[in-house]
Interface confidence: low
């Protein structure tokens, strides 16, 4: 039975040209995290494997930095970075937990962080 929950940074916004940290946290389970995938809609951004460490997709290596922790830092943001991001926790023995973050990249200097929310 999957008892864990993923807490994410929820809906967030950031300025064009800036950086943002995408964070997910898995709680309420003793399952072992074997791998975390960070995905943007139809693209794999990065993998953090328990054995192999971080692997950043070649097409994003100039703008994506691993961490902090199991999070992901996006740099040199453009308006095209607006959209859904998924943290996918592969765990044993529970299986897969997925968290969703929506990022809006703003042209203006007004960028407020949204509220946190839970995904079961």
């Amino acid at each position: 039975m999957m008892t864990g929950t993923i807490e994410t940074t929820g809906n967030i916004s950031a300025e064009k040209g800036g950086s943002i940290i995408l964070q997910c946290h898995l709680s309420s389970t003793t399952a072992q995290v074997t791998q975390v995938n960070w995905e943007q809609q139809d693209q794999l951004l990065a993998i953090c494997n328990a054995d192999l460490g971080w692997h950043i997709s070649p097409s994003f290596k100039d703008r994506v930095a691993p961490g902090p922790g199991l999070g992901l830092t996006l740099q040199s943001l453009t308006v095209n970075d607006t959209g859904e991001y998924f943290c996918i926790y592969h765990t044993y023995p529970d299986g897969t937990y997925t968290g969703r973050i929506f990022l809006e990249v703003l042209e203006s200097s007004v960028a407020e962080h949204g509220a946190r929310f839970q995904i079961p």
Epitope: T34, Q35, N37, E39, Q41, D42, L44, I47, N49, D51, L52, H55, S57, F86, H90, Y92, G95, T96
Partner: antibody, heavy 116, light 110 residues
Amino acid sequence: QVQLQESGPGLVKPSETLSLTCTVSGFSLSSSYMSWIRQPPGKGLEWIGIIGSNGNTYYANWAKGRVTISKTSTTVELKLSSVTAADTAVYYCARGGYRTSGMDPWGQGTLVTVSS
Amino acid sequence: DIQMTQSPSSLSASVGDRVTITCQASQNIYSDLAWYQQKPGKAPKLLIYRASTLASGVPSRFSGSGSGTDFTLTISSLQPEDFATYYCQQEHLVAWIYNVFGQGTKVEIK
């Protein structure tokens, strides 16, 4: 009853784009990974790629730049561009393939021959 | 990239024999491994998933074991219908992979 059925032209000319459709029934694509696999005559299984429940796609290194996998509510489509005779194979679709319970079931496969 | 190496590539056996096929992953894939059986002109059929779980409808003479990098498919008593080609497949990683399948093991009649 879970069923998968591949369809598409059996003959494609060199340099053209191979297009295949996998029509599914008995389950929802919105909660399933779907894989494409091929098998050249007399050879082993070659993984082409996979599409996730949320539309994420992952392609084999050899196919990147040439392959596109997409889906609708009941179909999964494979497009392979700039084909050569080496792309002649039986093409299969299958449910699963990534952190799942294996690829099951498989379609019956469709033979695609690349020839002028 | 994760490479899957099966051995042997082919073997000859008789009905009633115990047959063992091995699959080695180039890195730790935990228990994310499946085994398939394929007969000529047919689509592959799932036998084992998560390294050791028997798929629905598969006879109990088939069994799988292993975790990490080394895996084994065993047929305890080979039957006439078991002569086929067997493939292993890693389900651990699909990013930056060349092929998720091993090269296959053909089981022939001695």
